[in-house]
C-alpha cells in the first residue's frame, strides 16, 4: 500500500503565440480546481475509463478575476497535494490523466458550475520511494507544470510497496527465512501478505496480494469446491485447480421454476425468484407467510404471520413490487445528456448515445476538429459532432483547398465586368457607372453620386474591391 | 460512496405547505442529474421532479404549478418546495442522484426516505 502524490506548480498560458483568453472575467470570476486520474500499466485508455489506481480531487483555488486588457498570467492555484492512496502494489508503470478544471462563481442555481479547462495525459514509469519527478504537459495554448512521486505506507517498501518491514525481535538477526530490509537493517522483511480474504486452508500466495488454490478448490479466495459434475462430456472438463473453464449444461435450461418464477443461476445451483404467494426452492409450495422471507432485495415483510392473512413487503430504495422484486425506473430522470437514449440495465445504467456524442452519459461532444485542418488560413468550427472550414478569402470547399471563384456570384451591377485578383475582386465599369461594385451612376454633368472620387482615380476606372 | 440524506418531511393540513431538502456527500466529483420520486402504499414508485442531465427541469403532471425544484450547487444539494398540498400527495419522498464519482465512474444513489402525510 501506498500513496502517489501530485504536486501541481503552475497553470497558465504556454509558450508562443496565442495566448488563452483568461478563464476568468470581472463579470463571472472563477476558480480552479484539479483531478487526477490514475491507471496501471501503459495502456492508451479512453478518459472516461474507470481510474483502477485511484483518483483525487484537489480543492478550490482562489479565487480570480480577469483585470481587462492585462494578459492572462499563472492562475491561482489551490494549495495542497493531490494525494491517490492505493491498497495494493504499486504497479511501476501507470498512465495518468489530469484535468484542470473551472469553477464560476456567478449565480449558477440551476446549472453547472463548473467546465473543463484543459486535460493532459501521459504514461510514465516510476518506482516506488523515488524521488519527486517534474513534468510539463501543454493542452492547447495552456501549460501544466507540476511534480509526482509515489511512496509507499509503512510497513511496505520497497519500489512496488511488496516487501514489508517490522521492527526486529532480536536485536542481532532476522528470522528463519526473512532477510534484513535496505536500507532499514534495524528492520526485517515481514512474511508474504496474501489478497484479503484467501482462505487461509485452500488458498496460498508466492506474490503479495495473490491468492492461489490448492487442488479441489476454485475462485478468487479459493473458497469455492470444484464441481465435476457440470464439466461431463460434450463441453468437457478442465484441470481440477482452475475448476470448469466451460460449464456444463446451465442449471436453469428447461426452467425448474414452478407457478411463473423465474430462475438465475448461482454458483453452486440455481435459485428461483417466486411470485406473490408461492415460496420453496422450485416457487412449489403456496401459503406464504414473512417467516418464509417472501421479500427481496431487502425488503421488510409486515404482516403475514399465518398463511390466511396477508403480508406487504417495505421496499428499500430502488425496489418496488409486491416482493420488491422489480426496480424503479430510474431512467425517468434523464440522466443521458445531448438526446442519449437511456437503457436501465438493473446492475447499471447504460446511455446509447446520439450520432457526434459520447462518455458513459453522452457528455463529450466530439471534438471533429481534433486532428482536422483547413488549409489556406481556415479555421475549424465545429458543433453537433459536425465539423465545418470557415475559409480565408478566395478559397472555398469543406477543406478549403479549391480556389474560390469571386466573380462567379456577378457582384458587378450595371454590366460590370469582373475579374478575379489575389486580393478579392475588381470590377471594370461600363461607361457611367462608378464604384467597388459599380453601384454608383455617374451623373451628366460628370459630378458622381458620390461625395468625391479618390485622387487620380477618374469615374470610370476598375474600381479594386478588398 | 455517497450518501443521499433527506430532512423537511412530515405532518401538514390540505393546502399547506412543506420544503424538503436532500444533500449529497461522499465521493462525489459531479452530480449528473438528481431529484425526488416518491411512492405512496400500493403504488409504483414515480418521478416528482428532478435536474435531468442535460440541467433542465422535469415535473410530474399532478405536481406542476405546486411544487417547485431547486438546488444549490456548493451544497451538492437539491431542494423540492411543495405547496397546495393535497391528501393525494401523502407518501415516502425518496432523493436519487446520478453521481459522477471520482474515479469517473457513474452511480446511481436513492436516499432513506422522508414521509409526507397530508390530513385534515
Known amino acids: 500500500a501506498g500513496v502517489f502524490e501530485l504536486q501541481i506548480h503552475s497553470f497558465g498560458p504556454g509558450p508562443g503565440p496565442g495566448a488563452p483568453r483568461s478563464p476568468c472575467s470581472a463579470r463571472l470570476p472563477c476558480r480552479l480546481f484539479f483531478r487526477v486520474c490514475l491507471k496501471p500499466g501503459l495502456s492508451e485508455e479512453a478518459a472516461e475509463s474507470p481510474c483502477a489506481l485511484g483518483a483525487a480531487l484537489s480543492a478550490r483555488g482562489p479565487v480570480y478575476t480577469e483585470q481587462p486588457g492585462a494578459p492572462a498570467p499563472d492562475l491561482p492555484l489551490p494549495d495542497g497535494l493531490l494525494q491517490v492512496p492505493f491498497r495494493d502494489a504499486w504497479p511501476g508503470t501507470f498512465s495518468f490523466i489530469i484535468e484542470t478544471w473551472r469553477e464560476e462563481l456567478g449565480d449558477q442555481i440551476g446549472g453547472p458550475a463548473w467546465s473543463l479547462l484543459a486535460r493532459v495525459a501521459g504514461r510514465r514509469r516510476l518506482a516506488a520511494g523515488g524521488p519527486w519527478a517534474r513534468d510539463i504537459q501543454r493542452a492547447g495554448a495552456w501549460e501544466l507544470r507540476f511534480s509526482y512521486r509515489a511512496r509507499c505506507e509503512p510497513p511496505a517498501v520497497g519500489t512496488a510497496c511488496t516487501r514489508l518491514c517490522r521492527p526486529r525481535s532480536a536485536p542481532s538477526r532476522c528470522g528463519p527465512g526473512l532477510r534484513p530490509c535496505a536500507p532499514l537493517e534495524d528492520e526485517c522483511e515481514a512474511p508474504l501478505v496474501c489478497r484479503a480474504g484467501c482462505s487461509p486452508e485452500h488458498g496460498f500466495c508466492e506474490q503479495p496480494g495473490e491468492c492461489r488454490c490448492l487442488e479441489g478448490w476454485t475462485g478468487p479466495l479459493c473458497t469455492v469446491p470444484v464441481s465435476t459434475s457440470s464439466c461431463l462430456s460434450p463441453r468437457g472438463p478442465s484441470s481440477a485447480t482452475t475448476g470448469c473453464l466451460v460449464p456444463g449444461p446451465g442449471p436453469c435450461d428447461g426452467n425448474p421454476c414452478a407457478n411463473g418464477g423465474s430462475c438465475s443461476e448461482t454458483p453452486r445451483s440455481f435459485e428461483c425468484t417466486c411470485p406473490r404467494g408461492f415460496y420453496g426452492l422450485r416457487c412449489e409450495v403456496s401459503g406464504v407467510t414473512c417467516a418464509d422471507g417472501p421479500c427481496f432485495n431487502g425488503g421488510l415483510c409486515v404482516g403475514g404471520a399465518d398463511p390466511d392473512s396477508a403480508y406487504i413487503c417495505h421496499c428499500p430504495p430502488g425496489f418496488q413490487g409486491s416482493n420488491c422484486e422489480k426496480r424503479v425506473d430510474r431512467c425517468s430522470l434523464q440522466p443521458c445528456r445531448n438526446g442519449g437514449l437511456c437503457l436501465d440495465l438493473g446492475h447499471a445504467l447504460r446511455c446509447r448515445c446520439r450520432a457526434g456524442f459520447a462518455g458513459p452519459r453522452c457528455e463529450h461532444d466530439l471534438d471533429d476538429c481534433a486532428g482536422r485542418a483547413c488549409a489556406n488560413g481556415g479555421t475549424c468550427v465545429e458543433g453537433g459532432g459536425a465539423h465545418r472550414c470557415s475559409c480565408a478569402l478566395g478559397f472555398g470547399g469543406r477543406d478549403c483547398r479549391e480556389r474560390a471563384d469571386p466573380c462567379a456570384a456577378r457582384p458587378c451591377a450595371h454590366g460590370g465586368r469582373c475579374y478575379a485578383h489575389f486580393s478579392g475582386l475588381v470590377c471594370a465599369c461600363a461607361p457611367g457607372y462608378m464604384g467597388a461594385r459599380c453601384e454608383f451612376p455617374v451623373h451628366p454633368d460628370g459630378a458622381s453620386a458620390l461625395p468625391a472620387a479618390p485622387p487620380g482615380l477618374r469615374p470610370g476606372d476598375p474600381q479594386r474591391y478588398l | 460512496e455517497v450518501q443521499l440524506v433527506e430532512s423537511g418531511g412530515g405532518e401538514v393540513q390540505p393546502g399547506g405547505s412543506l420544503r424538503l431538502s436532500c444533500a449529497a456527500s461522499g465521493s462525489i466529483f459531479s452530480i449528473n442529474a438528481m431529484g425526488w420520486y416518491r411512492q405512496a402504499p400500493g403504488k409504483q414508485r414515480e418521478l416528482v421532479a428532478g435536474?435531468?442531465?442535460?440541467?433542465?427541469?422535469k415535473y410530474a403532471e399532478s405536481v406542476k404549478g405546486r411544487f417547485t425544484i431547486s438546488r444549490d450547487n456548493a451544497k451538492n444539494t437539491v431542494y423540492l418546495q411543495m405547496s397546495s398540498l393535497r391528501a393525494e400527495d401523502t407518501a415516502v419522498y425518496y432523493c436519487?442522484?446520478?453521481?459522477?464519482?471520482?474515479?469517473?465512474?457513474?452511480?446511481?444513489?436513492w436516499g432513506q426516505g422522508t414521509l409526507v402525510t397530508v390530513k385534515p
Open positions: 435536474f435531468t442531465g442535460d440541467g433542465s427541469t
Open positions: 436519487a442522484a446520478d453521481v459522477q464519482l471520482l474515479n469517473t465512474d457513474y452511480e446511481f444513489y
